[in-house]
Interface confidence: low
């Protein structure tokens, strides 16, 4: 069964850091372009960023609100995707989903909640 | 950046009736190199992650019932549910994956009349 499982969410103070993980199973992880998408409480979906696969240079792209603060990486040997979040702001409070893609986002995790509050 | 605009924001449809959701992109998401539209539709039910319904504007994802269909090209797209079922109550999002930053529409909440 294809599965993505996020972890690492929690409560953090503004200015703090958090690292999210997304463990993949049942798919050829190294082939997938992997994305992070977030959803603030009661709001719509917002794309955070993506990392391409190794053969495409593991290039990363980010949405403007997180550029320079968030960093996406992957470890294909562990089938794991990461989101390093620094300088967190209250507006970063959201459920964070990882989504595996064959271009469109075919597979989604269940999400992990990140709350940024003093 | 490409902006995705969905309409309507919410929609109430009777069971068995047809539901139509529209999505407009601020620039074309049609890639001339292969004549494909990089446009997807997702369904999100309460408390669940989104689920891919349609990619390439009109290709149903595996396991998606055939009452769901997508159409359109370039900048204007439509998701149609031909005969609404109770389990279709959800929020529907369109998304362009033509170029980063990838963008979702604001969502259309579909409920039963």
């Amino acid at each position: 069964e294809v599965q993505l499982v996020e972890s690492g969410g929690g409560l953090v103070k503004p200015g703090g850091s958090l690292r999210l993980s997304c463990a993949a199973s049942g798919l050829t992880f190294e082939r997938a372009w992997m994305n992070w998408v977030r959803q603030a409480p009661g709001k719509g979906l917002e794309w955070v960023g993506r990392i391409k696969r190794k053969t495409d240079g593991e290039t990363t792209d980010y949405a403007a609100p997180v550029k320079g603060r968030f960093s996406i990486s992957r470890d294909d040997s562990k089938n794991t995707l990461y989101l390093q979040m620094n300088s967190l702001k209250t507006e970063d409070t959201a459920v964070y989903y990882c989504a595996g893609s064959n271009r469109a986002f075919d597979i989604w995790g269940q999400g992990t909640m990140v709350t940024v509050s003093s | 950046d490409i902006v995705m605009t969905q309409s309507p924001d919410s929609l109430a449809v009777s069971l068995g009736e047809r539901a139509t959701i529209n999505c407009k992109s601020s620039q074309s998401v049609l890639y001339a190199g292969n004549n494909r539209n990089y446009l997807a539709w997702y369904q999100q039910k309460p408390g669940q992650p989104p689920k891919l319904l349609i990619n390439q504007a009109s290709t149903r994802a595996s396991g998606v019932p055939d009452r769901f269909s997508g159409s359109g090209s370039g900048t204007e797209f439509t998701l149609i549910i031909s005969s609404l079922q109770a389990e279709d109550v959800a929020i529907y999002y369109c998304q362009q994956y033509y170029t980063p930053p990838l963008a979702f529409g604001g969502g259309t909440k579909l409920e039963i009349k």
């Epitope: 190294e30 082939r31 696969r53 053969t55 | -």
Partner: antibody
Framework: EVQLQQSGPELEKPGASVKISCKAS????????MNWVKQGNGESLEWIGY????????RYNQNFKGKATLTVDKSSSTAYMQLKSLTSEDSAVYYC???????????WGQGTSVTVSP | DIVMTQSPATLSVTPGDRVSLSCRAS??????LHWYQQKSNESPRLLIK???QSISGIPSRFSGSGSGSDFTLNINSVEPEDVGVYYC?????????FGAGTKLELK
Amino acid sequence: EVQLQQSGPELEKPGASVKISCKASGYSFSDYNMNWVKQGNGESLEWIGYVDPYYGDTRYNQNFKGKATLTVDKSSSTAYMQLKSLTSEDSAVYYCALSETPRAMDYWGQGTSVTVSP
Amino acid sequence: DIVMTQSPATLSVTPGDRVSLSCRASQSISDYLHWYQQKSNESPRLLIKYASQSISGIPSRFSGSGSGSDFTLNINSVEPEDVGVYYCQNGHSLPLTFGAGTKLELK
């Protein structure tokens, strides 16, 4: 178990065209690129190109542009390669090869021998 | 195009020998280098991916190393069934390119 079953040997006259097939089984056909590789008698391997069944996109080695056309039929999980304007230089064994690992060739068909002779 | 150069062209070995096959890329390809074995009258098969990653079902005597432009395939104790031609492949840039091969034979 992944299997790639290629069509049988072909004997063609110069100037003719030939279309060889590669029927895939044991995996989700649309998920991975299908490569085609040429091997002349006693020679090394030469990559012709690949087709991405998900979209039908193709990438070709410049040396084979205009010579080879790669297509797929998703309904039958079959990849095809057509070679046109055949000359003796086209006599070779042609392999289809599946890229489960991006830009590597994890699984190979048994090869199809094409002989071009007057 | 990236040119892949393999050496030696032929290698004569005795069962139990440790052997090293060399592959050089005409420009840096990081670790996007794959190795294949082709036995007589058979299709090639993938031995090593990304320079050093092992493949399920491939005996542990096969290992790979290298990065950038210089790569090595090692067979730590050659078996008679290892006779064949070994090819390296650039997986970095299109067109994908193969080396000319190293023929491994028994003395």
